[in-house]
C-alpha cells in the first residue's frame, strides 16, 4: 500500500479579520494510527493549534466528525480571525507511539493571510489654543489595518493640505499597521467655524475612506476688538459711554470698567450677538453722572478674554464741557450693560 | 448572489442612455459596484465605480460623459451623449469581500450598439 | 495611470502543457493583481486575486506569483475547458483605480 501523504490543497488563503478561516487537509491512508495536529509555524517554536486528542480549543472547530471509523478529512475552522492569526499552517499526522505520539508527515503548509480594517482616524490638535496668523499641528492615527499600503490625506474645509508628515509603523513585515500623522496649518480669523479632515483609505474599506475630524472652535482664540464711544443722554449731566467688544472668541470674557483707574464695576459677558464666522460681539455700557467729578475723568474699558492677559481702550470725558451743580457728591449712576447688536 | 445588466440597445449618435444592473443575494449598500465595456473583438476597459455609500469614482479618460448612481437594488449607468465608439458590452461586477482590488461576481453583460 | 502589459497576446498550446502569462505594471502595485478567464459571449471568471491566492471554486492547476512590477499566471495542465483569454486587472492604492491589460489568448495548438 502508498505510503499516508497529507495533502493541503490551498498554498494560501486570505480571510478578512472577524470572518472564519477553513484551513483544509486530508490524509490518503487510516495506516498509520495516530492522531493529526495542526500547527502554526515549523520547527521547534512552532504553536499548536489544533490536537485531535486532547485540549481545549475554543475558536477551532473540525469541518467533518473525526470520530467516524474511516474519516479522512482534517480540515479545521477558526473563527474570528484577527490579524495576529497570521502565519503559516501545517496539518501534522502523527504515528501512536508510547509514551508520546512520533511525528510521521507535514502536509506543505497554509499560508494564512489576514486583511484588516483600519480603525477609525483619531484628530488630535494642540493643548492650547492659538491665534490667527499663528501655526498649529494637528495628528491623526489609525491603527490595525492589513496590509500596509494606506493612504491619508488631510483637508481644511475641504481644501487638501499638502504640509504634512506620515509615518507608518512598523516598517518591516508585521501582522498589522499603524498610521501617524500631522499637519501644519495656519489659522485665520475665520477659522471658528472650520474644520480639519483626516481621510484614510484601505483596499478594506468599500470605496469610501475614512475620516476623522477636529473643528477649530475648539482650537483657535480670536482676540477682541474694543471701542469705546461717548453718547449723551436726556438727563442733564450724565453721558451713557460705551464699550463696544467685537470678533472674539471663544465667549469667556470679563470686562471691567476703571473710572481714572479706579474699578467702577466688572461684568462678565453673558448675553452675546453671534456673527456669521462664529465669533462675537458684545456691548457694555456705562452711565457716567458728571457733575460728581470736578476734573476730567479717564474711563477705561479693560477686557480680560478666555484667560489671557488684560486688553483695554480708554476714553477722556471732559467735565469742563458740563455744566456743574454746586454740593453735588452722587457716585457715578447706575451701569447698564446689556447686549445690543452692532 | 448575483448581477445583471439591462437597457443595452441600438442608440443613436449624440443621444443618453442608461443601463441598469439589478443585484441580487446582497445588499449594495455593503459593497463597491464597478462598470466596465469591451468593445467587439477588444479587451476589458474599466468606466467608473460606486461606493457602498453612493460616491462615484470614474477612470480619466471619462471626463464627464458618463453618471454612476444607484438606488438600494440598481445601479445604473447614465450614457450622457453617446458616439460610435462606445458600441461595445457593458458589465456591471461587484468587489470581493475582502477588499476592492477584485471583481468576484459579473453580470453577462449587455450589448449598447451606436449607429445613426 | 498605470499601464499594463500582457505577454504574449496569444499562445497555441497542447491539452497537459503548462502555460504562463505574465503582466507587467508601469509601476509598483504591490500584490494588488487579479486575473481573469474569459470564454467567448461570456463575462469574465476570477481566478486569481492579490496576485497569488485562488478564487474559491478555482482549479488547483491555476496558480498565481508576482509582487511590485512583475507578476505571472500558471496553467500547470491545460485542459480542454482552459482554452480562453486571460486577463490581468489591477489596483493602484494611491490612484484607487483600475487597470486591465490586453488581454492573452490561448488557442489550441
Known amino acids: 500500500e502508498e505510503e499516508l501523504q497529507v495533502i493541503q490543497p490551498d498554498k494560501s488563503i486570505s480571510v478578512a479579520a472577524g470572518e472564519s478561516a477553513t484551513l483544509h487537509c486530508t490524509v490518503t491512508s487510516l495506516i498509520p494510527v495516530g492522531p493529526i495536529q495542526w500547527f502554526r509555524g515549523a520547527g521547534p517554536g512552532r504553536e499548536l493549534i489544533y490536537n485531535q486528542k486532547e485540549g481545549h480549543f475554543p475558536r477551532v472547530t473540525t469541518v467533518s466528525d473525526l470520530t467516524k471509523r474511516n474519516n479522512m478529512d482534517f480540515s479545521i475552522r477558526i473563527s474570528n480571525i484577527t490579524p495576529a492569526d497570521a502565519g503559516t499552517y501545517y496539518c501534522v499526522k502523527f504515528r501512536k507511539g508510547s509514551p508520546d505520539h512520533v511525528e510521521f508527515k507535514s502536509g506543505a503548509g497554509t499560508e494564512l493571510s489576514v486583511r484588516a480594517k483600519p480603525s477609525a482616524p483619531v484628530v488630535s490638535g494642540p493643548a492650547a489654543r492659538a491665534t490667527p496668523q499663528h501655526t498649529v499641528s494637528f495628528t491623526c492615527e489609525s491603527h490595525g489595518f492589513s496590509p500596509r499600503d494606506i493612504t491619508l490625506k488631510w483637508f481644511k474645509n475641504g481644501n487638501e493640505l499638502s504640509d504634512f508628515q506620515t509615518n507608518v509603523d512598523p516598517a518591516g513585515d508585521s501582522v498589522s499597521y499603524s498610521i501617524h500623522s500631522t499637519a501644519k496649518v495656519v489659522l485665520t480669523r475665520e477659522d471658528v467655524h472650520s474644520q480639519v479632515i483626516c481621510e484614510v483609505a484601505h483596499v478594506t474599506l468599500q470605496g469610501d475612506p475614512l475620516r476623522g475630524t477636529a473643528n477649530l472652535s475648539e482650537t483657535i482664540r480670536v482676540p477682541p476688538t474694543l471701542e469705546v464711544t461717548q453718547q449723551p443722554v436726556r438727563a442733564e449731566n450724565q453721558v451713557n459711554v460705551t464699550c463696544q467688544v467685537r470678533k472674539f472668541y471663544p465667549q469667556r470674557l470679563q470686562l471691567t470698567w476703571l473710572e481714572n483707574g479706579n474699578v467702577s464695576r466688572t461684568e462678565t459677558a453673558s448675553t452675546l450677538t453671534e456673527n456669521k464666522d462664529g465669533t462675537y460681539n458684545w456691548m457694555s455700557w456705562l452711565l457716567v453722572n458728571v457733575s460728581a467729578h470736578r476734573d476730567d475723568v479717564k474711563l477705561t474699558c479693560q477686557v480680560e478674554h478666555d484667560g489671557q492677559p488684560a486688553v483695554s481702550k480708554s476714553h477722556d470725558l471732559k467735565v469742563s464741557a458740563h455744566p456743574k451743580e454746586q454740593g453735588s457728591n452722587t457716585a457715578p449712576g447706575p451701569a447698564l450693560a446689556s447686549a445690543a447688536p452692532l | 448572489q448575483s448581477v445583471e445588466e439591462s437597457g443595452g440597445r441600438l442608440g443613436q449618435p449624440g443621444t443618453p442612455l442608461t443601463l441598469s444592473c439589478t443585484v441580487s443575494?446582497?445588499?449594495?449598500?455593503?459593497?463597491?459596484m464597478g462598470w466596465f465595456r469591451q468593445a467587439p473583438g477588444k479587451g476589458l476597459e474599466y468606466i467608473g465605480i460606486i461606493s457602498s455609500s453612493g460616491s462615484p469614482y470614474y477612470a480619466s479618460w471619462v471626463n464627464g460623459r458618463f453618471t454612476i448612481s444607484k438606488t438600494s437594488t440598481t445601479m445604473d449607468l447614465k450614457m450622457n451623449s453617446l458616439r460610435s465608439e462606445d458600441t461595445a458590452t457593458y458589465f456591471c461586477?461587484?468587489?470581493?469581500?475582502?477588499?476592492?482590488?477584485?471583481?468576484?461576481?459579473w453580470g453577462p453583460g449587455t450589448l449598447v450598439t451606436v449607429s445613426s | 495611470d498605470i499601464q499594463m502589459t500582457q505577454s504574449p497576446s496569444s499562445l497555441s498550446a497542447s491539452v497537459g502543457d503548462r502555460v504562463t502569462i505574465t503582466c507587467r505594471a508601469s509601476?509598483?502595485?504591490?500584490?494588488?493583481l487579479a486575473w481573469y478567464q474569459q470564454k467567448p459571449g461570456k463575462a469574465p471568471k476570477l481566478l486569481i486575486y492579490?496576485?497569488?491566492f485562488l478564487y474559491s471554486g478555482v482549479p488547483s492547476r491555476f496558480s498565481g506569483s508576482g509582487s511590485g512590477t512583475d507578476f505571472t499566471l500558471t496553467i500547470s495542465s491545460l485542459q480542454p475547458e482552459d482554452f480562453a483569454t486571460y486577463y490581468c486587472q489591477s489596483w493602484h492604492y494611491i490612484s484607487r483605480s483600475y487597470t486591465f491589460g490586453q488581454g492573452t489568448k490561448v488557442e489550441i495548438k
Open positions: 509601476q509598483s502595485i504591490n500584490s494588488y
Open positions: 492579490s496576485a497569488s
Open positions: 443575494g446582497f445588499s449594495l449598500s455593503s459593497y463597491v
Open positions: 461586477a461587484r468587489v470581493g469581500p475582502l477588499g476592492v482590488d477584485y471583481f468576484n461576481i
